[in-house]
């Protein structure tokens, strides 16, 4: 079947990095500069991705593979294949329509991206606040108030701070 197909369609013999040139009797021609074909049998080459502005080149384009971009320092990738670059903020901030803004009281962000999230409500688990929260850190919940009453023989070791979930991209 493969042999039959190649007899019927000479383009199937054109390897990656070339295209089947209809203007030249279906000869396999190399992809022009700044273009590529990642599979054989292509009738055209694709234009290479250009990494510009806040995008920088992570991998150069070749005749057989597209360029890959990442983000310049101070930005991070969003989307498949780094289709967008989003500005970083400092820990304790989030990106708003006015740029990076400090987290409101009662919320925190321990990353350079994502949104400010509410502190854990220790009382919902019957615990008390062992370490107060900040703009950058969640509260640390400790033993319940009953465990701290006078005469209690032992103190329950504090629960570890919850691992904040990553905000959706």
């Amino acid at each position: 079947f493969e042999r039959t197909r190649s007899l019927q369609d000479p383009c199937s013999n054109c390897p990656a990095g070339t295209f089947c040139d209809n203007n030249r009797n279906q000869i396999c021609s190399p992809c022009p500069p700044n273009s590529f074909s990642s599979a054989g049998g292509q009738r055209t080459c694709d234009i290479c991705r250009q990494c510009k502005g806040v995008f920088r080149t992570r991998k150069e384009c070749s005749s057989t593979s597209n360029a890959e971009c990442d983000c310049t320092p101070g930005f991070h990738c969003l989307g498949a294949g780094c289709s967008m670059c989003e500005q970083d903020c400092k820990q304790g901030q989030e990106l708003t329509k006015k740029g990076c803004k400090d987290c409101c009281f009662g919320t925190f962000n321990d990353q350079k991206r994502g949104i400010c999230r509410p502190w854990t409500n220790c009382s919902l688990d019957g615990k008390s606040v062992l370490v107060n929260g900040t703009k950058e850190r969640d509260v640390v919940c400790g033993p319940s108030p009953a465990d701290l009453s006078p005469g209690a023989s032992s103190v329950t070791p504090p629960a570890p701070a919850r691992e904040p979930g990553h905000s959706p991209q």
Epitope: R49, K52, G53, E86, Q87, T96, G99, C100
Partner: nanobody, 122 residues
Framework: EVQLVESGGGLVQPGGSLRLSCAVS????????MSWARQAPGKEFEWVSS???????YYVESVKGRFTISRDNAKNSVYLQMSSLRPEDTAVYYC????????????????WGQGTLVTVSS
């Protein structure tokens, strides 16, 4: 071919003013949101300001009240009027399209100019 060409940069004393221009060609400017970003020497890129096709504007806090972004659809141009300039405003300023309409976020399909250098020094 899409082109964004910035001009108007230069040396200015602290407290002075400059007006940057960005002339655009090769796409439908009137329906495109536009933005300005800057990169200070040895520092990271920073979003500065954006303007919707409707004229609605956004600014980073550090330039609010000092910088004004505007557009002239008849001239296919976007401007950044900068006043009360400070040494920390020294940077290369870039004009770019703004397809995401999200502050501080650019898409891979956005177009960028080559930049114009603004130096604020006495």
């Amino acid at each position: 071919e899409v082109q964004l060409v910035e001009s108007g940069g230069g040396l200015v004393q602290p407290g002075g003013s400059l007006r940057l221009s960005c002339a655009v060609s090769g796409f439908t400017f009137s329906s495109s949101a536009m933005s300005w970003a800057r990169q200070a020497p040895g520092k990271e890129f920073e979003w500065v300001s954006s303007i919707y096709s409707s004229g609605k504007t956004y600014y980073v806090e550090s330039v609010k009240g000092r910088f004004t972004i505007s557009r002239d659809n008849a001239k296919n141009s976007v401007y950044l009027q900068m006043s009360s300039l400070r040494p920390e405003d020294t940077a290369v300023y870039y004009c770019a399209t703004w397809k995401t309409l999200r502050v501080g976020v650019w898409d891979e399909s956005d177009y960028w100019g080559q930049g114009t250098l603004v130096t604020v020094s006495s």
